[in-house]
Interface confidence: medium
Amino acid sequence: FNISGCSTKKLLWTYSTRSEEEFVLFCDLPEPQKSHFCHRNRLSPKQVPEHLPFMGSNDLSDVQWYQQPSNGDPLEDIRKSYPHIIQDKCTLHFLTPGVNNSGSYICRPKMIKSPYDVACCVKMILEVKPQTNASCEYSASHKQDLLLGSTGSISCPSLSCQSDAQSPAVTWYKNGKLLSVERSNRIVVDEVYDYHQGTYVCDYTQSDTVSSWTVRAVVQVRTIVGDTKLKPDILDPVEDTLEVELGKPLTISCKARFGFERVFNPVIKWYIKDSDLEWEVSVPEAKSIKSTLKDEIIERNIILEKVTQRDLRRKFVCFVQNSIGNTTQSVQLKEKRG
């Protein structure tokens, strides 16, 4: 299809080389009730339609994204050629940063009502640059946490070094929806609830003598509880003795509950005590078996190929630790009688 009639928007993504970062493009098609842009060309080239972020109007809920190769080749369907770019409804998610994401992206509805309709489409010219070290050293992270039940704030990473007074007007989106009220580089959340979690996008306009660009940053916001004040507790094994059959294989499971910590470095390991000696056992990797807002249950097994007489004299100790402290539970094997 002919893309010369597409409206054009220029975006700039300045990514930090220090952190993982995502990016999004919205299919900024006009809402049907607010513009005639998607109908037969009633607009002269000088008339600019009113462009509003896509809000999921029924007739525009299914869009197709393309990339325009710089060498003039035909448009490429995003889904077929770019595994690091994911389409979710009307939003294009870039999972990894890099200058190779620079280029022209075109979106249009899949359902074109009639062949006479001018292709209703938007062309987004994306420029991707790494952040220079001269930029702000303490810019806000692209991953921000809000503490449930308290007051918090979400900062626009690309503007977090500027004071509120010198900051340009910012447009914010949450999960693709315009937050019409928020206009500054920092959103104050009066009281944090779990519904504040999500993907926030902040946009502001940067102009030079030639043209203007929308500078965009994406913030993943997580709602969290306060860090635990407790050391982990061992849920299993509960008993300090375990009946076993000699010569048979044996798996002993250690399950421990760790309270939430923003910086989470759980330790769960098995070691063996034999008279005065003790040594750590190389056992299968620990795995998370349940994770909630407040805590996480982690399991790690010790596997004995076959229980020997010597094992009956040993103590098998599960050791768990977080930043607050550690807990141990020892198990003595006992031969099954009869």
Epitope: I154, E182, D190, E191
Partner: antibody, heavy 121, light 111 residues
Framework: QEQLEESGGDLVKPGASLTLTCTAS?????????ICWVRQAPGKGLEWIAC????????TYYASWAKGRFTISKTSSTTVTLQMTSLTAADTATYFC?????????????WGPGTLVTVSS | DVVMTQTPASVSEPVGGTVTIKCQAS??????LAWYQQKPGQPPKLLIY???KLASGVSSRFSGSGYGTEFTLTLSDLECADAATYYC?????????????FGGGTEVVVK
């Protein structure tokens, strides 16, 4: 019983300033509430003026027409004020103090009886 | 600010009848809409919050529906005591849900 009461309504001349006070009883303005002011001109509809968050952020929100001329403040754990400047006859109304709870459905669950402000020369 | 357009401005129905009041928001407010009843000389009383949830102590004859930009309040089996002015109200859509703009009101006359 939780109650709100407005005071400070008066007859004033155009161009004057006036401060209205909202006093809580049975609860304090330290929780996660929005305390807001709404007005109603005689025989007319309800008009939202401003809100303040009673929690730690103290965030304030204003109707676009009220910015600059009206100021909402929390003055104590049981009082919120509305300062009004450059009053005109169009500001003649009953002013209500109302309370909301952010997660409680985003609506005004508690209203004061109102205080009358008359601006006339 | 969002603009809330309420229709009709006035409606008259007999006892036992049904009244439907509509409220249209100038932008998508999801389900953040409340309905109030006001009688002369009294402050308004909350009837419905979050578009369809009945406030505590309110008769089930009142019901609310809608989402996005179109909302409806229905009063069924009208009683004389339902004669009042009814207002819709939206909520500021940001990260903080602050109730704000009201519709123009609908006067309900019960014959």
């Amino acid at each position: 019983q939780e109650q709100l009461e407005e005071s400070g309504g008066d007859l004033v001349k155009p161009g004057a300033s006036l401060t209205l006070t909202c006093t809580a009883s049975g609860f304090s303005f330290n929780g996660n509430y929005y305390i807001c002011w709404v007005r109603q001109a005689p025989g007319k509809g309800l008009e939202w003026i401003a809100c303040i968050y009673a929690g730690s952020s103290g965030s304030t929100y204003y109707a676009s027409w009220a910015k600059g001329r009206f100021t909402i403040s929390k003055t104590s754990s049981t009082t919120v004020t509305l300062q009004m400047t450059s009053l005109t006859a169009a500001d003649t109304a009953t002013y209500f103090c109302v309370r909301d709870k952010p997660a409680g459905g985003s609506s005004y669950t508690l209203w004061g009886p109102g205080t009358l402000v008359t601006v006339s020369s | 600010d969002v603009v809330m357009t309420q229709t009709p401005a006035s409606v008259s129905e007999p006892v036992g009848g049904t009244v439907t009041i509509k409220c249209q928001a100038s932008e998508d407010i999801e389900s953040y809409l409340a309905w109030y009843q006001q009688k002369p000389g009294q402050p308004p009383k909350l009837l419905i919050y979050q578009a369809s949830k009945l406030a505590s102590g309110v008769s089930s004859r009142f019901s609310g529906s809608g989402y996005g930009t179109e909302f409806t309040l229905t009063l069924s089996d009208l009683e004389c005591a339902d004669a009042a002015t009814y207002y819709c109200q939206c909520t500021l859509y940001g990260v903080n849900f602050v109730p704000n703009v009201f519709g123009g009101g609908t006067e309900v006359v019960v014959k």
